[in-house]
Amino acid sequence: QEGKFSGPLKPMTFSIYEGQEPSQIIFQFKANPPAVTFELTGETDNIFVIEREGLLYYNRALDRETRSTHNLQVAALDANGIIVEGPVPITIKVKDINDNRPTFLQSKYEGSVRQNSRPGKPFLYVNATDLDDPATPNGQLYYQIVIQLPMINNVMYFQINNKTGAISLTREGSQELNPAKNPSYNLVISVKDMGGQSENSFSDTTSVDIIVTENIWKAPKPVEMVENSTDPHPIKITQVRWNDPGAQYSLVDKEKLPRFPFSIDQEGDIYVTQPLDREEKDAYVFYAVAKDEYGKPLSYPLEIHVKVKDINDNPPTCPSPVTVFEVQENERLGNSIGTLTAHDRDEENTANSFLNYRIVEQTPKLPMDGLFLIQTYAGMLQLAKQSLKKQDTPQYNLTIEVSDKDFKTLCFVQINVIDINDQIPIFEKSDYGNLTLAEDTNIGSTILTIQATDADEPFTGSSKILYHIIKGDSEGRLGVDTDPHTNTGYVIIKKPLDFETAAVSNIVFKAENPEPLVFGVKYNASSFAKFTLIVTDVNEAPQFSQHVFQAKVSEDVAIGTKVGNVTAKDPEGLDISYSLRGDTRGWLKIDHVTGEIFSVAPLDREAGSPYRVQVVATEVGGSSLSSVSEFHLILMDVNDNPPRLAKDYTGLFFCHPLSAPGSLIFEATDDDQHLFRGPHFTFSLGSGSLQNDWEVSKINGTHARLSTRHTEFEEREYVVLIRINDGGRPPLEGIVSLPVTFCSCVEGSCFRPAGHQTGIPTVGM
């Protein structure tokens, strides 16, 4: 029939599977007078034949790997053998079958990897080829690790990229590989065609021997450095070493100290540059960083710890120029008069700060010397020989030597002899009645004045009055301040009053002296007073359980995801309605009843993290009082920004004609989060044909070099497209353009005739 298998002479394309014996004709061409016969030319390979009557067929199985396309021509001839139609192109496309197995380029591979290398960073590639069509599963290769020897605790230390054959460490491998325990490993790698998905796939295996080398980029042991060193500085205290020569070392002071007394040289030796003072700072923590020649970190920083060792370079110091104590006339022998507490800035709990106390002089020596003693290590003064009499000697002065193991300091103590404390404080009123206050009365307010009197010697510890609340205020909402001149007590609010928990409080005060009462005298009912505090209700705003609520989510969470929640309670027990304020980006909504917060739009860490909004809790009913808290949403990074050029590269030029191939360096960046090591971009040209003229080579994770492959460029501008892949999860690729002008130069700059177009480049390469 006309159509599928027969028809007039015209350009046609046929697809035939390789490896199949001929089973039917390809096509029957019909002749139009005066044409009577047909002839076949081109890449027939003695396989394709056309009979004179126009029957096109093939006589044996095709092989795509020998020839994937046969370009034939068919012509129609008249009775005299003259071409009257055509020749027209007939294309035979040979379709692939899986008739070739993949083979590794090497039967054995060898490589090395440094311990603690970054997981996922390839250190070796295995490579296999398959003659079948890579555009079909027949030629799509799938790499796998068959076995790892040795295998410790069933943990894989190595992984392979199924598509590229790149071998790298797993996270466990990065953490656990140790050449001291196992210096070498063997992997058996398989490769399958059919993308590894078919039972009928072909395969091959190879062996990979891996040597684990030591990572010498390790934090040194903590260093101890004695303070106030008199040796010439700088002094080497420790060292770090990168695994390869050529690293550039630096120190990072995370504490941002006003003076940072350490340095590092280009060998990695770390020095202290000036004497240290333990009393100023007793320990330092800083970081050593190794960078490549472009200033990119080669690995994570190392933490350096320096402890400053104490020497005894501080004498004891007295608590004040004169320390004053009081002692009653009739106090018994051994009674404590007070404790002298001297200080020493040297290290606590060491011999350098351990103090001894000794009385070196007493004046006057009346009625005798040695009336007082001091506990050698505690500094507590005691009455040593007899009771004192005020009318004989109202005041004693002691000189006390305080010493550590190297220094001595003299401290002065004044001891005042006071009247015996044989009178108790007596309240002028035993009941101060009722006091009604609103629960929102200000903190610091004086709400009541109380007064007791004491008949002992004025302005001594025997007559001074201290007021204590001994009952009715377990929460410590109230306090009493005493006027030292009048012994008046002022009752003040120290913490907010609360109607909901304490509407009525029955308060009891006690008035006491700082000095002990003489033997036989006791405080009685006269030293106690009471009053009743009545607190009235005020409608209070709801109270949030936290000042700041914080939540953490990935920036790519689906719209409608719950990202956090807040809680508040109303003191009066009313229901609460929640709302948001300051959601400037329109990213969030809050459930008015539960306080749960949901995303309502795509989040973006690069727009700013944490994202801060206010949450408002409002009473439902009542006076609709509200209170505000903060909600901070920390957005965790995902790889959602393609790489781009780090700066504007307009104005790049080469002087024309090129005398030799030239190159220029460019830098890429992206807006995603990169930890210490920074990004790891890969670079390639943006189209196949650009490879005729240019090549791009990686310098490090962020920089690459664009080089000309020849010198035969026209005098014009070229826009070179470069693909930059960030290798992230998922990997993102950006295509960037570098405009490069080839121009005539005068003194190394582009020459511009008058009236030439603007936008002329200015940076020569």
Partner: nanobody, 126 residues
Framework: EVQLVESGGGLVQAGGSLRLSCAAS????????VGWFRQTPGKERDFVAA????????RYADSVKGRFTISRDNAKNTLYLQMNSLKPEDTAVYYC???????????????????WGQGTQVTVSS
């Protein structure tokens, strides 16, 4: 394969405006450089404007600078050419084009564009 179809041409008075559209089908408009060229009878195709897809930088022939604007809408897979202050000498068939593997760096050369539309006629009368 990318198929490009232009639309929006027509007859317009000098000083008027037109907006040409170029819809891409077959696969997304993902080629790195897309552009507009124009051709008058008996002459070669001339570069009008190009847009580098990442970063969105644009380039124009001197004769149209300040009057024509090239843009794209990725969501609609469409390239546009907004033509203002049209002159009689802008009369031509306008073609939309996209680079492919032939691109060698000269974004104003027709030979370096692999995919072409069938063209749309723009006539500016005086």
């Amino acid at each position: 394969e990318v198929q490009l179809v232009e639309s929006g041409g027509g007859l317009v008075q000098a000083g008027g405006s037109l907006r040409l559209s170029c819809a891409a089908s077959g696969r997304t408009f993902s080629e790195p450089i897309v552009g507009w060229f124009r051709q008058t009878p008996g002459k070669e195709r001339d570069f009008v404007a190009a847009l580098i897809s990442t970063g969105g930088s644009t380039r124009y022939a001197d004769s149209v600078k300040g009057r024509f604007t090239i843009s794209r809408d990725n969501a609609k897979n469409t390239l546009y050419l907004q033509m203002n202050s049209l002159k009689p000498e802008d009369t031509a068939v306008y073609y939309c084009a996209a680079t492919g593997d032939s691109y060698r760096g000269a974004d104003d050369r027709p030979a370096e564009y692999d995919y072409w539309g069938q063209g749309t006629q723009v006539t500016v009368s005086s």
